[in-house]
Interface confidence: low
């Protein structure tokens, strides 16, 4: 990722342009950081890659530094929230964004405990904003499907993040290709399923149907 230990405001804006943001508590003015086993609120001015988040496929919330997705463990829902592999079936990984709240299933929402750990609870409302964006709503960065070109899945959208070569990729990658073309997997594990496609070049003109879909003869 090449993320510096501390993120400058300029670097933060570059990340925001890529849909990557720092989640700040509107009331407490601290930011969510993914720790080794829990999430905590920390000083936003010491932002690092473990404070960087991105909305991904299937309503997931992916942490760049921790390479994992925010998960709600139903067997202990009010325990501190943690990161999980993004295709885990043991926890709920789906989150909704609404009026600065991050809500999961059964009306659980992301909140802060007295010890500054981040928890899911039904008791209160806690509002979250995008740090460094003038109080902007993190809902502005919601994931949009990116449909693939060619490959072997007939235009299926990229699955972000996807695991390839021991790493979770939250954006299209050139890794593993000598032709320098951007590609993505269309399921969460490339080595397992080998489903993939090329990513549209964001600098080129709108991609037409012919490019993605096979024509009926």
């Amino acid at each position: 990722e090449g993320v510096a230990a501390a993120l400058t405001p300029e670097r933060l804006l570059e990340w925001q342009d890529k849909g990557i943001f720092v989640i700040q508590s509107e009331s407490l003015k601290k930011c969510i950081q993914a720790g080794k086993s829990v999430l905590t609120l920390e000083n936003c001015k010491q932002a690092n890659k473990h404070m960087l988040w991105k909305w991904v496929s299937n309503h997931g919330l992916f942490n760049i530094g921790g390479s994992g997705c925010l998960g709600l463990n139903f067997s202990a829902p009010e325990q501190p929230l943690s990161l999980y592999e993004c295709d885990s079936t043991l926890v709920s990984l789906r989150w909704r964004c609404n009026r600065k709240m991050i809500t999961g299933p059964l009306q659980y929402s992301v909140q802060v405990a007295h010890d500054n750990t981040v928890v899911a609870s039904r008791k209160y409302i806690h509002k979250w904003i995008s740090y460094g964006s003038g109080g902007g709503d993190i809902c502005e960065y919601l994931h949009k499907d990116l449909h693939t070109i060619k490959g072997n899945t007939h235009g299926m959208p990229c699955m972000f993040p996807f695991q390839y070569n021991h790493q979770w990729h939250h954006e299209c990658t050139r890794e593993g290709r000598e032709d320098d073309l951007l590609w993505c997997a269309t399921t969460s594990r490339y080595e397992r399923d080998e489903k993939w496609g090329f990513c549209p070049d964001p600098t080129s003109a709108e991609v037409g149907c012919d490019t993605i879909w096979e024509k009926d003869l």
């Epitope: 993914a34 720790g35 080794k36 905590t40 921790g66 994992g68 990161l83 592999e85 010890d115």
Partner: antibody
């Protein structure tokens, strides 16, 4: 700026129990870190003993597990090491350290970024 | 347990030399490898984490590389203050383990 300081007896009799405490200052032991003990026998390399999280969860080095207990006292912001049935081979400088780092998916990825100055423990009668 | 083997165990070099220390793991540890520097009578100091990330405050002449089982610590131009013992450490799976150390001495 977080600092760690080891304390405890410098001399322990063979077959006795070595007891050390690590005081955490400048930060909370309840932060999202693990806390380790590492030792270094005279003229030798580093050996990891074990670690604890503020919840009380522990991991121990299998080679020492039967003799080691690591505990935490959140009210005093400190954690402790007990090593039983000591012999001369347990003579070493004992360090406490903070394990910082991150969970990548389902794998822990961490390092020791803050260390105490170390305390020398000699096992001798 | 995952064993880490450092080589060489010791080396003699002159100020300005390029020095390379290797660390080999008994099984793949991806890039979950850290490097520490320890001077005589002093506390170990974290130099590099996750195989290649230089810690803040560590001089840029230190660099790390590697993935899987083979890792390298390089000092591009050895300085007087770099004479010390260097340890690799894996955090891939408990128990954490250290290499036996590489002592860098003045030639």
């Amino acid at each position: 700026q977080i600092t760690l300081k080891e304390s405890g007896p410098g001399l322990v009799k063979p077959s006795g129990t070595l007891s050390l405490t690590c005081a955490v200052s400048g930060g909370s032991i309840s932060s999202s870190n693990w806390w380790s003990w590492v030792r270094q026998p005279p003229g030798k390399g580093l050996e990891w003993i074990g670690e604890i999280y503020h919840s009380g969860s522990t991991n121990y080095n299998p080679s020492l597990k039967s003799r080691v207990t690591i505990s935490v006292d959140k009210s005093k912001n400190q954690f402790s090491l007990k090593l039983s049935s000591v012999t001369a081979a347990d003579t070493a400088v004992y360090y406490c350290a903070r394990d910082d780092g991150w969970r990548y998916g389902s794998v822990y990825y961490y390092y020791m970024d803050v260390w105490g100055k170390g305390t020398t423990v000699t096992v001798s009668s | 347990d995952i064993q880490l083997t450092q080589s060489p165990s010791s080396l003699s070099a002159s100020v300005g030399d390029r020095v390379t220390i290797t660390c080999r793991a008994s099984q793949s540890i991806d890039d979950h490898l850290n490097w520490y520097q320890q001077k005589p009578g002093k506390v170990p100091k974290l130099l590099i984490s996750s195989a290649s990330t230089l810690q803040s405050g560590a001089p840029s002449r230190f660099s790390g590389s590697g993935y899987g089982t083979d890792f390298t610590l390089t000092i591009s131009s050895l300085q007087v203050e770099d004479f010390a013992t260097y340890y690799c450490q894996q955090s891939y799976s408990p128990p954490q383990t250290f290499g036996q150390g590489t002592k860098v001495e003045i030639k």
